[in-house]
């Protein structure tokens, strides 16, 4: 009876996500068969989050709307380890929008999910950010410095990275 009600709950939760994510990849968390964590297929997972690399070229605002439709946001990078995971799936000759912007052009950077901007946990390329008109952040590869962040114009189409919390069922 307990297993039956648990299964019913899982099914109803899966239905919530079915509209945007028809297929989920789930793994058992720890030793308890009761707890599963899932990411939409073919998203990748790291710690408690799922990531999707969008290869369509769109403006920053449209990229964020696109992530939002999937129940996600443009990626918020909280640690060096997280960035190191993300870059494994990126192409060196491309740039990808992050969920970081400065809409007022006053160098008050803000993350899309309201995570406080911490200057100590940023990975700007040297000399960046460098232009008050460039109000959105990308991650890209520079041969001299490997992967890092750069400020660019928000209306310039780029690829992007979406991030969402894992789905627990």
């Amino acid at each position: 009876n307990f297993m039956y009600s648990k299964t019913v709950k899982r099914l109803s939760k899966l239905r919530e996500y079915q509209q945007y994510h028809p297929s989920l990849t789930c793994v058992m968390e720890g030793k308890d068969i009761e707890d599963w964590s899932c990411c939409p297929t073919p998203w990748t997972s790291f710690q408690s989050s799922c990531y999707f690399i969008s290869t369509g070229m769109q403006s920053w605002t449209k990229s964020q709307k696109n992530c939002s439709v999937m129940g996600a946001d443009l990626v918020v990078i909280n640690t060096r380890e997280e960035q190191d995971f993300i870059i494994q799936n990126l192409k060196r000759n491309s740039s990808y929008f992050l969920g970081l912007s400065d809409p007022g052009g006053r160098r008050h950077w803000q993350w899309v999910d309201q995570t406080p901007y911490n200057e100590n946990v940023t990975f700007w390329h040297s000399g960046e950010p460098n232009n008050l008109d460039e109000r959105c952040a990308i991650i890209n590869f520079r041969s001299s410095e490997e992967w890092g962040w750069n400020d660019i114009h928000c209306h310039v189409p780029q690829k992007s990275i979406c991030k969402m919390k894992k789905i627990y069922i």
């Epitope: 403006s59 605002t61 709307k65 912007s101 809409p103 008050l132 109000r135």
Partner: antibody, heavy 121, light 111 residues
Framework: EVQLVESGGGLVKPGGSLRLSCAAS????????MSWVRQAPGKGLEWVAT????????YYPDSVKGRFTISRDNAKNSLYLQMNSLRAEDTAVYYC??????????????WGQGTTVTVSS | DIVLTQSPASLAVSPGQRATITCRAS??????????MHWYQQKPGQPPKLLIY???NLESGVPARFSGSGSGTDFTLTINPVEAEDTANYYC?????????FGGGTKVEIK
Amino acid sequence: EVQLVESGGGLVKPGGSLRLSCAASGFTFSSYGMSWVRQAPGKGLEWVATISSGDSYTYYPDSVKGRFTISRDNAKNSLYLQMNSLRAEDTAVYYCARQLYYSYGYYFDYWGQGTTVTVSS
Amino acid sequence: DIVLTQSPASLAVSPGQRATITCRASESVSFHGTHLMHWYQQKPGQPPKLLIYAASNLESGVPARFSGSGSGTDFTLTINPVEAEDTANYYCQQSIEDPPTFGGGTKVEIK
């Protein structure tokens, strides 16, 4: 007072080339993105090219891509548009416009008087 | 590309009356309360002149009889009351993404 003065327009045969110039004054030219916008006789406005303040970014519509090149010389406070392989449909008044950024986009807050380009055999 | 459709294509208004021009975008040009739609006036033989930026902000030096409103895909420029010197073409422009695009224009004539 902000001023933008275009020059370099004229009559050119199809397949020919022209270089338009825009002399800027009254503001710190190097701090602003700039664009060229054109208007065919009796028609509406059509954006032609954009260059960022730092010269790091240029952008063109498909209609002129590969034929037109926007550039700037911040030391001379000047904007340029090199137009090659000109076609009859490029006939228009070409305006130089300053971009002012607002939030995630921008608008054109100052425009020059325009220079006329006529492509005809 | 985002397509902007202006209506009407032309209108004739008596002095002192209200003129209303609409601009419809093929997709939203708004984001988190910011509306990236702008309006320009162009008189015969002159370059365009900025009237309204970000849907509703009056550019410095523009008379208060000009106003803008709207969000998402639908925007309006209102001139109230219209004066004889307002005879011109009016254009909307979006800048939320490249390429920047303009509406086809609305010709306003004073009766």
